[in-house]
């Protein structure tokens, strides 16, 4: 699997999404987990609903949301509050039985907020809106890693 | 046990629409996508798309983009199945079946609707 | 899309005989393979799913077979209920496809 890189600004929401055969993977759940060091396990973050037809409903583990399009074949991930400690190496999987399919690599950047010095004035604060979709839009950038990147930093 | 019963034939002129019933029995309609399929006359089946009664999500086949629409009414466990912009070639036996979740084939299927397209 | 090609396209049989009809896929499904029988005037009913799993109430003389592109439908002992057009249904990629079908007449 190649690795995709998602690029998101600290303080906001980065959308990540893993396209798949809705086919292949009828009636599997999905999850999305963090890779612990390179060759290290994947640590399950969040996972699809367990009845597979109500895949479409968000769910959430803190600030991470997964939704699966079943029929569509995309799964995505919402990381909000995006966070500097947020960076690394992540998976898309498709889970049947104890087994999972790699659906996609993602290595998630976070890029300083521009914006920092603001007021505290000018933050926006959840309790403002109804719905966090309806009040803040999602920024996300991605790109294949280029052959020969190391989506780790060489340990010392 | 497991029911699909469709409406009645139809016949149509061309340019006009269709619009075919599955009422589903015997089983919990919200817990299986339904999807339709198509058969022309002494001809093989064609698959048509597929909708999730639960989110009422669609996927057509490309072949039916932007002449297909697929509904369903959980109230009283039906799914629909329209198509718009009828042409000869149209005319054809239109089954609904309903597919389980560990694998994509259809289990249980509607008697069929013939939908014959004539000037 | 993938194209699902099945052979023979007809055959002749008599009843207590062993039938034999394959599909073929034009890339790789895995075992992502169904196969269905329809009589005159019928809906097509479920035989086997993922290539080998007879589907709840269907007669344990029919056996399916194969994996990647190959595959194949095998009727035993061929009864005379059995007559009739079968069809492979490949489920491994979208948009699922079918076969143009076999047709099982009697000798």
């Known amino acids: 699997h190649n690795t995709t890189v998602f690029q998101g600004v600290a303080g906001q929401s980065l959308q990540v999404s893993c396209p798949y055969d809705s086919m292949k993977h009828w009636g599997r759940r999905k999850a999305w987990c963090r890779q612990l060091g390179e060759k290290g396990p994947c640590q399950r973050v969040v996972s699809t609903h367990n009845l597979w037809l109500l895949s479409f409903l968000r769910r959430w583990n803190g600030s991470t949301a997964i939704t699966d399009d079943t029929l569509g074949g995309t799964l995505t991930i919402t990381l909000r509050n995006l966070q500097p400690h947020d960076a690394g190496l992540y998976q898309c999987q498709s889970l049947h039985g104890s087994e999972a399919d790699t659906l996609r690599k993602v290595l998630v950047e976070v890029l300083a907020d521009p914006l920092d010095h603001r007021d505290a004035g000018d933050l926006w604060f959840p309790g403002e809106s109804e719905s966090f979709e309806d009040a803040h839009v999602e920024h996300s950038i991605s790109r294949s890693l280029l052959e020969g990147e190391i989506p780790f930093p060489p340990t010392s | 046990q497991v029911q699909l019963v469709q409406s009645g034939a139809e016949v149509k002129k061309p340019g006009a629409s269709v619009k075919v019933s599955c009422k589903a029995s015997?089983?919990?309609?919200?817990?299986?996508?339904m999807s339709w399929v198509r058969q022309a006359p002494g001809q093989g089946l064609e698959w048509m798309g597929v909708?999730?009664?639960?989110?009422?999500?669609?996927v057509y086949a490309q072949k039916f983009q932007g002449r297909v629409t697929m509904t369903r009414d959980t109230s009283i466990s039906t799914a629909y199945m329209e198509l718009s912009r009828l042409r000869s070639e149209d005319t054809a036996v239109y089954y609904c079946?309903?597919?389980?979740?560990?694998?994509?084939?259809?289990?249980?299927w509607g008697q069929g609707t013939l939908v014959t397209v004539s000037s | 899309d993938i194209q699902m090609t099945q052979s023979p396209s007809s055959l002749s049989a008599s009843v207590g005989d062993r039938v034999t009809i394959t599909c073929r896929a034009s890339?790789?499904?895995?075992?992502?393979l169904a196969w269905y029988q329809q009589k005159p005037g019928k809906a097509p009913k479920l035989l086997i799913y993922r290539a080998s799993s007879l589907q709840s109430g269907v007669p344990s003389r029919f056996s399916g077979s194969g994996s990647g592109t190959d595959f194949t439908l095998t009727i035993s002992s061929l009864q005379p209920e059995d007559f009739a057009t079968y069809y492979c249904?490949?489920?491994?990629?979208?948009?699922?496809?079918f076969g143009q079908g076999t047709k099982v007449e009697i000798k």
């Open positions: 890339q790789d499904i895995s075992n992502y």
């Open positions: 909708i999730n009664p639960v989110s009422g999500n669609t």
């Open positions: 015997g089983y919990t309609f919200t817990g299986y996508h």
């Open positions: 079946a309903r597919i389980p979740s560990y694998t994509y084939a259809f289990d249980y």
């Open positions: 249904q490949q489920h491994g990629h979208s948009p699922t496809t």
